[in-house]
């Protein structure tokens, strides 16, 4: 903590200008009057002030806003917010996009992935739900971001949005993610032909339970060893090697390259050996001819 | 073949909450998503909301407040909670299953339950 | 949400005659709806999806068209085991919301 010193009267504040930089911290301490401070915000980011000006102007606001930040504030925070922790972040209510794109690109460069999530996640709570606008913003300036969000958040993303979020938006999401958003992929696309809505479910396709793999084996898309290898292994492991054969058609090949890796390495392990020879790739592992495999460990018949 | 079979208690005082238990045998929980719709008596159907085995929900905004869906995919089941019931959550609650087939994208049901009359009476 | 208009509330049809069944959407739902038969103390089942496609096992007098807001549910000859509860349900955007029904009653 900086140390309470008097203020000289020669060097009292009445505007937040570039003379500042000359202050020592504790002079900062002592002259700065944080309601001044805040009403000034928008001309802090333009002074060059040095990172330990910057910890005394945070410990100011801090002290002025103890339950957290007013939007005013934030909005021209700048350069201020890379002193900002997740845990300050989290008081704050942000509604604006303005915001959330100014703090964004002073994000850029800087590691600062928990405080850009943080960030988004106030704004969704601020707005309420995760609208078009919002994801736009994202895509735009914050590419990858969308994933930062928890699941929980992401559930209020409507259907109608989903076509604004692209391949690239989706590439750091998890299991969990894609298990909110497929369902409202699939909502949102169900009107398209069959060779446009592959094109456009593929990238949520990690949320899809093992029906919507099947009938995509049937409808001649050959799927990208990529996106094969996003899909759930609980999804791929009932498939049979005629339907994996189906659903990759050309790429099938791929599977001698993943061999080991999950989630080929599991399926194999399912599948018998004798129809994982007709596939001709030298696919080891299968089930061996004449064996019975109990599976006691889910309490299903076949269907 | 896939049964749906709905347990729970036929009678729940009001300012309660209403549990109930869909089993899901002859096969997996984890290929399809599942539902809950309720028929107050003498009318028609209202969807309260839906789960994949991974434990990701949707549920109807009228009842989110007050519904918790939930999923134990070691028991091949899952479980509806309605909090704060009212005499107006009297109802047959049955599960169901959402198709799930992309050929025919859509959430509609192609399996059911047979239902359980709950009861909201002190 | 969208809500589903069903009409009539009630239809008197005789066996062996054609019976037409509405469903109305308050926006459009393109092709996205299914209709349903429900009788008595049991639940309902499925009979036609996508507007106009038969489910597994319905017998061909079933038939449904439309898209839009505008769907129609026909049987073409009424059977006894025909005459039941009737609903309309939309998936073309959550919440997923169903008609209040038509109960096809015999004459």
């Known amino acids: 903590d900086v140390e309470r010193t008097t203020c000289p009267p020669e060097k009292e504040v009445h505007e937040i200008d570039e003379s500042l930089i000359f202050y020592k911290k504790r002079e900062l301490e002592a002259c700065v009057d944080a309601a001044l401070l805040a009403a000034q915000m928008d001309r802090v980011d333009a002074i060059p002030f040095t990172y330990e000006q910057l910890d005394v102007l945070k410990h100011k606001l801090d002290e002025l806003y103890p339950q957290g930040y007013p939007e005013s504030v934030i909005r021209h925070l700048g350069h201020l917010f890379l002193k900002m922790s997740p845990e300050d972040i989290r008081k704050w209510n942000v509604t604006s996009l303005e915001t959330l794109k100014a703090l964004l690109k002073v994000s850029k460069g800087h590691e600062m992935s928990a405080q850009v999530a943080t960030l988004i996640d106030r704004v969704v709570v601020g707005r309420g739900q995760l609208d078009k606008d919002t994801v736009d913003t994202l895509t735009a300036f914050c590419p990858g971001c969308l994933c930062s969000l928890s699941p929980e958040r992401l559930s209020s993303v409507p259907p109608s949005v989903i076509g604004a979020v692209r391949p690239q938006d989706l590439d750091t999401c998890g299991p969990r993610q894609l298990d909110v958003l497929y369902p409202k992929a699939r909502l949102a696309f169900q009107n398209m032909s069959g060779s446009e809505y592959f094109v456009k479910i593929r990238p949520f396709l990690g949320g899809a339970p093992t029906e919507d793999v099947k009938a995509l084996s049937q409808q001649n898309v050959s799927m990208d060893l990529a996106t094969f290898m996003k899909l759930r292994r609980e999804a791929v492991l009932p498939l049979t090697v005629a339907e994996v054969q189906k659903l990759l058609g050309p790429h099938v090949e791929g599977l001698k390259v993943e061999e080991q890796h999950s989630p080929v390495r599991d399926w194999i392990l399912k599948q018998r050996q004798d129809d994982l020879d007709t596939l001709g790739l030298g696919l080891q592992g299968g089930i061996p001819n004449g064996y019975l495999i109990l599976d006691l460990s889910v309490r299903e018949a076949l269907s | 073949q896939v049964q749906l079979q709905e347990s729970g208690p036929g009678l729940v005082k009001p300012s309660e909450t209403l549990s109930l238990t869909c089993t899901v045998s002859g096969g997996s929980i984890q290929n399809y998503y599942w539902s809950w719709v309720r028929q107050p008596p003498g009318k028609g159907l209202e969807w309260i909301g839906y789960i994949f085995y991974s434990g990701s929900t949707n549920s109807n905004p009228s009842l989110k407040s007050r519904v918790i869906i939930s999923v134990d995919t070691s028991k091949n089941q899952f479980s509806l909670k309605l909090s704060s019931v009212t005499a107006a959550d009297t109802a047959v609650y049955y599960c169901?299953?959402?198709?799930?087939?992309?050929?025919?994208?859509?959430?509609?049901?192609?399996?059911w339950g047979r239902g359980t009359l709950v009861t909201v009476s002190s | 949400e969208i809500v589903m208009t069903q009409s009539p509330a009630t239809l008197s049809v005789s066996p062996g005659e054609r019976a037409t069944l509405s469903c109305r959407a308050s926006?459009?739902?393109?092709?996205?709806l299914a209709w349903y038969q429900q009788k008595p103390g049991q639940a309902p089942r499925l009979l036609i999806y996508?507007?106009?496609t038969r489910a597994t096992g319905i017998p061909a007098r079933f038939s449904g068209s439309g898209s839009g807001t505008e769907f129609t549910l026909t049987i073409s000859s009424l059977q006894s085991e025909d005459f039941a509860v009737y609903y309309c349900?939309?998936?073309?955007?959550?919440?997923?919301?169903f008609g209040q029904g038509t109960r096809l009653e015999i004459k």
């Open positions: 926006q459009s739902v393109n092709a996205n």
């Open positions: 996508g507007a106009s």
């Open positions: 349900q939309q998936y073309n955007n959550w919440p997923l919301t």
């Open positions: 169901a299953r959402e198709v799930g087939r992309i050929a025919v994208a859509g959430w509609f049901f192609d399996l």
